[in-house]
Interface confidence: low
């Protein structure tokens, strides 16, 4: 399985990572959650520059998620609707995060406790959406590399949303379920 | 990266039937929709039918008695078996894999049938 | 089924210029989830098609800005402000809402 991200740096305020929010519950494909220009929600099906988000933790186990490309923060209105906000609104927008013991993580709205679906695509009948959450596997997503002065090499950061932050144990074996074969 | 690679026969008898492969690589037939699509000079571009991830098919009504979609997760191939040719059958096929809101997104190299004794 | 008309058959440009295309469905495509699934593909000589826009405005990956879609119901326009030369060739448009899918019958966009 993938290293989920239950790091304890993740569970205080602050806290930064870069993400895309895979998931396999979706009825038709796979997907990642994706923050539109025009403040829809959608599902990609593969990695593109509208699914990489920020996540932010805002207090133990609450995050905030921020589209990167868009600078929009993913909202819930209280019947469930999912829309990309330019400003962010505490209750609207802010979701607790569930880490599952498989690497998945369930969010639910802090204000409503609603589960964060994304919004159905067209199965049919017969290809159902699951019941229950929907559960989210959280890939890293690299920030943008900043140009380094010739013959100088950086250190790699920490990666905080790891449970080796560090790199003491070696490279994650984990793949996600899209390369799955 | 993504791939679809078909393979098949170029030349098909008349009243015979046509078989492609569409082996897929980069992604897993567990999560996604592959489609197959055929363009000719006369009818343009024409949707024959799909399978979705959980194996269960969708197929265009006039080509529905004639026409089986199935696929092997494990091997990552989709098979497409078509009946009963006839000279305007003669085509380029495509399979094409879905996207989560739209259709086409990568599709395979197209096998140019031709449909002649 | 679904046919989808497509207007004009042929389009002359010269580079630089605004281009918009026509497609008209015989019935609502709506799909019973609320979206209208209707995308626009561009194909080049032998190349398989390229998707440009899908559910009516939204711009694929990579698609440059100057394409937008439009339209509701039954009417659908696609618009390229300034055309260039790697935008000629076949353009169609194609409803994924209702079995069997249908494309239009396509628009040859091309030098005058």
């Known amino acids: 399985h993938p290293i989920p991200d239950s790091s304890p740096l993740l569970q205080f305020g602050g806290q930064v990572r870069q993400r895309y929010l895979y998931t396999d519950d979706a009825q038709q494909t796979e997907a990642h959650l994706e923050i539109r220009e025009d403040g829809t929600v959608g599902g990609a099906a593969d990695q593109s520059p509208e699914s990489l988000l920020q996540l932010k933790a805002l207090k133990p186990g609450v995050i905030q998620i921020l589209g990167v490309k868009t600078s929009r923060f993913l909202c819930q209105r209280p019947d469930g609707a999912l829309y990309g906000s330019l400003h962010f609104d505490p209750e609207a927008c802010s979701f607790r995060e569930l880490l599952l013991e498989d690497g998945y993580n369930v969010y639910q709205s802090e204000a409503h406790g609603l589960p964060l679906h994304l919004p159905g695509n067209k199965s049919p009948h017969r290809d159902p959406a699951p019941r229950g959450p929907a559960r989210f596997l959280p890939l890293p997503g690299l920030p943008p590399a900043l140009p380094e002065p010739p013959g100088i090499l950086a250190p790699q950061p920490p990666d905080v949303g790891s449970s080796d932050p560090l790199s003491m144990v070696g490279p994650s074996q984990g793949r996600s379920p899209s390369y799955a074969s | 990266q993504v791939q679809l690679i078909q393979s098949g026969p170029g030349l098909v008898q008349p009243s015979q039937s046509l078989s492609i492969t569409c082996t897929v690589s980069?992604?897993?037939?567990?999560?996604?929709?592959i489609h197959w699509v055929r363009q000719s000079p006369g009818k343009g571009l024409e949707w024959l039918g799909m399978?979705?991830?959980?194996?269960?098919?969708d197929y265009n009504a006039a080509f529905m008695s004639r026409l089986s979609i199935t696929k092997d997760n494990s091997k990552s191939q989709v098979f497409f078996k078509m009946n009963s040719l006839q000279a305007d059958d003669t085509a380029i096929y495509y399979c094409a894999r879905n996207g989560y809101d739209y259709e086409f997104v990568y599709w395979g190299q197209g096998t140019l049938v031709t449909v002649s004794s | 089924d679904v046919l989808m008309t497509q207007t004009p058959l042929s389009l002359p440009v010269s580079l630089g210029d605004q281009a918009s295309i026509s497609c008209r469905s015989s019935q609502i495509i709506v799909h019973n989830n609320g979206d209208t699934y209707l995308e626009w593909y561009l194909q080049k000589p032998g190349q398989s098609p390229k998707l440009l826009i899908y559910?009516?405005?939204n711009r694929f990956s990579g698609v440059p800005d100057r394409f937008s879609g439009s339209g509701s119901g039954t009417d659908f326009t696609l618009k390229i402000s300034r055309v260039e030369a790697e935008d000629l060739g076949v353009y169609y448009c194609f409803q994924g809402s209702h079995v069997p899918y249908t494309f239009g019958g396509g628009t040859k966009v091309e030098i005058k």
């Open positions: 399978i979705w991830k959980s194996g269960n098919t």
């Open positions: 559910k009516i405005s």
């Open positions: 980069g992604f897993s037939l567990t999560g996604y929709a």
